[in-house]
Interface confidence: low
């Protein structure tokens, strides 16, 4: 609460996160024209990335385009992209939705459809829906340990959210254990009134707010964090503004001296840890 | 404007960016001693990296050192690095400018020059100028969508820069469309009074400032962002302080059971999104 | 110092870092059952990662698990993980400490010990201590150049920590050169009262605080940074809260058409650059 006689100072903060959990993923895998069910295990090195500071990312879904090579090929026949003659294709044109540069030729995409030929990583990425349910939907049971060190330089005061008395096998609960800094991802979503299973399909951004309201006067000293959670991306966002949260990355390799790549479109939850608050002292 | 009767609170912010665009790169490629013109296509997975939060990076230029292997070789004969006898070479010495550890021997670099032998990734990186014009100079036409969610926790108020009424095919313009949050990279530079083509060669840092001056009183409510742009790196910086913006990263692979790497010195623009402002309420 | 008549404004900051240095690493390498001493050179592309903004990471130690493949294998026999019969193993169970999903079978790990079989990246990571002394302990002699651009938008004032008069071959010293922005990593630790060699084993987080106390009135103008250093991770942290600083990442490759990976557990120092302060003007 506001104590008007106090000198207030904003918090300086540093955050360190550690995600734990394993996901079993079952998906259709096509090899040599034969489709079969594949099982694989994803651990932290597979679904998260070495990130700095106030954010961490957990991949919950993905679409792979394997064995792409730089050459010419028909672009993906998304809505409005089909052609019937070369007139429809403009040499050198880069459609922002497309994945390449048009050569000016209209070529067969498959037996029934023709699209503009592009110079690109081929075959071009199929614009298919993200798998539903999400491949790593079991990430709901992953946990994250959040370590937060704070400093009020003007008051020369430092503390952290993890105290020596804390138990490393706890799990945060708003009522039963509000000071535990190990959070189950599904619980974070539940607290924010969101459905993990649903968000995991397209991805999203979740805020973990850590509020420090510190009274640093010796006679009524109090300085512990309060955690709250809210969704940061707009779930009602128009398609044109790219709903959810995803990014593409590539794994490059050589085969028969040809540079190839596997393109991964990774959907997932980016967790932003937003630390704020003040330290007040007479 | 300052309303002294209001309680002011700093903004808590989360940012999400999405870059779009394709670049065609034409460069000399040497294979088996023969140099010829190579064309390649770069899409987002090739020129940008999965980044968190308030920064994104667009590669605009690069220098590759292919097929490096850990062994002994002469260091690159940059200014002051040549030798005529072993006396000039100090075993175990690591020159900060060099890329390896000296063995103590002075060996031929080419037909006319000798340099100190080093234990390093060999052949060592040639210290050549960044290509001019920049290889991905067409990145000027890339666009970035910036999503910004803000929160004034004390006032329990949340909003975002993208409104449901907005059009996903807009492009930001200071006069005609100052609320559009899709920015053409070249326009950002123009607004900041900088030349994209020039900066793309060595790289640089560009600030996108988002200022929220929010009046949260119901009778005169206003809370929309104002965008401005300024260059953050020092274009007049002395050579010794590393002008521009670049970093090195490596792609590792095995060939005939030997661990090799391709070293990429990536030049580019790092865009920092700096969100600030206050929310005031009676 | 506080000038009550001034209008104070918090700093808006952008940071760019550049690490320099080479490490020679000597470690036991096992190939075809034969263990021999291997020497390798690590340069910036090997021990640091392309990072944004206010953090940079320097790897000081690592543990590798090479040639992992997705299959079934016995889990690592850490404390409490051994079994004598299938009853001890629960099909579908994921122990947060384990690296896979139990099949329900108890199988031999080696000649003397049995553990629960798991579906995982196999062979599973051995939970061995981080090498002591740290493999890249010579990182103590690496240097980092820190460029900091600051802005007080309300006062329309911009400056940076590097001035044209500065010498690019300086090294920061609290007394002799407190304005030099090139820091030896070992000196940062010394200033913070910490032992680099010790922290390098398990990793840690080090704060570099840059404090700008700016008087922007023309008659007594002053605006230069003050640097200070403090350790941000808790060195006395209980084992259950993951002391130090490490993360796992993987290098994926194909061998005889089988997807494999090398898992690297990287220990190191994350440096957080914490910029704060105010600009005051009448």
């Amino acid at each position: 609460s506001d104590k008007l006689y106090q000198r207030k100072e904003p918090v300086i903060s540093s955050v360190h996160t550690k995600v734990k959990g394993i996901a079993e993923v079952t998906e259709n895998v096509t090899e040599g024209g034969v489709t079969k069910l594949g099982h694989s295990i994803f651990d932290t090195a597979d679904y998260t990335f070495p990130l700095q500071g106030n954010s961490f990312f957990v991949m919950t879904n993905y679409v792979k385009s394997e064995g792409q090579v730089q050459t010419l090929c028909p672009e993906y026949p998304r809505r409005g992209a089909q052609c019937s003659s070369d007139r429809r294709c403009k040499k050198g044109w880069m459609d922002p939705q497309s994945k390449g540069i048009q050569t000016g030729r209209c070529v067969p995409y498959d037996k029934t459809r023709k699209t503009c030929e592009v110079s690109a990583w081929c075959p071009t990425e199929e614009e298919k829906e993200a798998p539903r349910p999400a491949l790593l939907r079991s990430a709901e049971n992953f946990t994250v340990l959040i370590k937060n060190n704070i400093h009020f330089p003007g008051h020369n005061y430092t503390t952290r959210n993890i105290l020596p008395t804390m138990n490393g096998s706890c799990t945060f609960h708003k009522t039963w254990d509000p000071q535990c800094s190990i959070f189950r991802l599904g619980d974070i979503f539940q607290e924010a009134g969101e459905n993990f299973t649903e968000v995991a399909v397209q991805g999203g951004i979740m805020g973990i707010e850590i509020y420090w309201d510190c009274n640093l006067d010796s006679w009524s000293h109090h300085c512990r964090p309060r955690y709250s959670f809210r969704r940061l991306d707009d779930k009602n966002m128009d398609e044109s503004f790219v709903p959810g949260y995803n990014f593409r990355y590539a794994k490059y390799y050589k085969e028969n001296n040809v540079e190839k790549r596997t393109l991964i479109k990774a959907f997932g939850i980016r967790f932003d840890i937003l630390v704020f608050g003040t330290g007040g002292k007479f | 404007s300052d309303k002294l009767y209001q309680r002011k609170e700093p903004v808590i912010s989360s940012v999400h960016t999405k870059v779009k665009g394709i670049a065609e790169v034409t460069e000399n490629v040497t294979e088996g001693g023969v140099t010829k013109l190579g064309h390649s296509i770069f899409d987002t997975a090739d020129y940008t990296f999965p980044l968190q939060g308030n920064s994104f990076f667009v590669m605009t230029n690069y220098v590759k050192s292919e097929g490096q292997v850990q062994t002994l070789c002469p260091e690159y004969p940059r200014r002051g690095a040549q030798c005529s006898s072993d006396r000039r070479c100090k075993k175990g010495w690591m020159d900060p400018q060099s890329k390896g550890i000296q063995t103590g021997r002075c060996v031929p670099y080419d037909k006319t020059r000798k340099t100190c032998e080093v234990s390093a990734w060999c052949p060592t990186e040639e210290e050549k100028e960044a290509p001019r014009p920049a290889l991905l100079r067409s990145a000027e036409n890339f666009t970035v969508l910036i999503k910004n969610n803000i929160h004034f926790p004390g006032h329990n108020y949340t909003t975002r820069n993208i409104l449901p009424t907005m059009n996903g095919s807009c492009t930001f313009h200071k006069t005609w469309d100052p609320q559009c949050s899709i920015f053409r990279l070249g326009d950002i530079f123009q607004e900041a009074g900088e030349n994209f083509t020039e900066v793309a060669v060595q790289g640089g840092i560009m600030g996108i400032e988002i200022y929220w001056d929010c009046n949260l009183d119901s009778w005169s409510h206003h809370c929309r962002p104002r965008y401005s742009f300024r260059r953050l790196d020092d274009k007049n910086m002395d050579e010794s302080f590393v002008p521009g913006y670049n970093f090195r990263y490596a792609k590792y692979y095995k060939e005939n059971n030997v661990e090799k790497r391709t070293l990429i010195k990536a030049f580019g623009i790092r865009f920092d999104i700096l969100v600030f402002g206050t929310g005031g309420k009676f | 110092s506080d000038k009550l008549y001034q209008r104070k404004e918090p700093v808006i900051s952008s940071v760019h870092t550049k690490v320099k240095g080479i490490a020679e690493v000597t470690e036991n390498v096992t190939e075809g059952g034969v263990t021999k001493l291997g020497h390798s050179i690590f340069d910036t592309a090997d021990y640091t990662f392309p990072l944004q903004g206010n953090s940079f990471f320097v790897m000081t130690n690592y543990v590798k698990s090479e040639g992992q493949v997705q299959t079934l294998c016995p889990e690592y026999p850490r404390r409490g993980a051994q079994c004598s019969s299938d009853r001890r193993c629960k099909k579908g169970w994921m122990d947060p400490q384990s690296k896979g999903i139990q099949t329900g079978r108890c199988v031999p790990y080696d000649k003397t010990r049995k553990t629960c079989e798991v579906s995982a990246w196999c062979p599973t990571e051995e939970e061995k201590e981080a090498p002591r002394p740290a493999l890249l302990r010579s990182a103590e002699n690496f240097t980092v150049l820190i460029k900091n651009n600051i802005h007080f938008p309300g006062h329309n004032y911009t400056t940076r920590n590097i001035l044209p008069t500065m010498n690019g071959s300086c090294t920061f010293h609290k007394t002799w050169d407190p304005q030099c922005s090139i820091f030896r990593l070992g000196d940062i630790f010394q200033e913070a009262g910490e032992n680099f060699t010790e922290v390098a084993v398990q990793g840690g987080i080090m704060g570099i605080e840059i404090y700008w106390d700016c008087n922007l009135d023309s008659w007594s103008h002053h605006c230069r940074p003050r640097y200070s250093f403090r350790r941000l991770d808790d060195k006395n942290m209980d084992e259950s809260f993951v002391p130090g600083y490490n993360f796992r990442y993987a290098k994926y490759y194909k061998e005889n058409n089988v997807e494999k990976r090398t898992l690297i557990k990287a220990f190191g120092i994350r440096f957080d650059i914490l910029v704060f302060g105010t600009g005051g003007k009448f």
């Epitope: 090579v69 050459t71 090929c73 040499k91 050198g92 081929c122 028969n256 | 065609e24 010829k36 190579g38 | -």
Partner: nanobody, 122 residues
Framework: EVQLVESGGGLVQAGGSLRLSCVVS??????MGWFRQAPGKEREFVAT????????YYGDSVKGRFTIFRDNAKNTVYLQMNSLKPEDTAVYYC?????????????????WGQGTQVTVSS
């Protein structure tokens, strides 16, 4: 060293067929093309094929009669020539391009074979 070696040329009567082959060693190209040069004339584009075998393109004079296809595993490109006419008489060159654009232009083809003679008699 990069080598392109053509074979399969010869003498054939009008209306007949021939199949030309071009084996590439030392490099893999994004686009492989065939060009031809008749006596006293400029070199003319015949056909090209990308990495994807469906991805082929033909000069106007040979459309519907010639088929280009590529066996990536063997690093070989073929030109099947049916319904041959006397005006198809020329030296046929195989060419490789690292470029992905403008593959009908001989300027983007960096590597060439020695050529194989095709003669169509009436």
């Amino acid at each position: 060293e990069v080598q392109l070696v053509e074979s399969g040329g010869g003498l054939v009567q009008a209306g007949g067929s021939l199949r030309l082959s071009c084996v590439v060693s030392g490099r893999t190209f994004s686009a492989m093309g065939w060009f031809r040069q008749a006596p006293g004339k400029e070199r003319e584009f015949v056909a090209t094929v990308g990495w994807n075998p469906m991805n082929s393109y033909y000069g106007d004079s040979v459309k519907g009669r010639f088929t280009i296809f590529r066996d990536n595993a063997k690093n070989t490109v073929y030109l099947q020539m049916n319904s041959l006419k006397p005006e198809d008489t020329a030296v046929y060159y195989c060419a490789g391009s690292g470029s992905l654009l403008d593959v009908t232009s001989e300027a983007v083809y960096t590597d060439w074979g020695q050529g194989t003679q095709v003669t169509v008699s009436s």
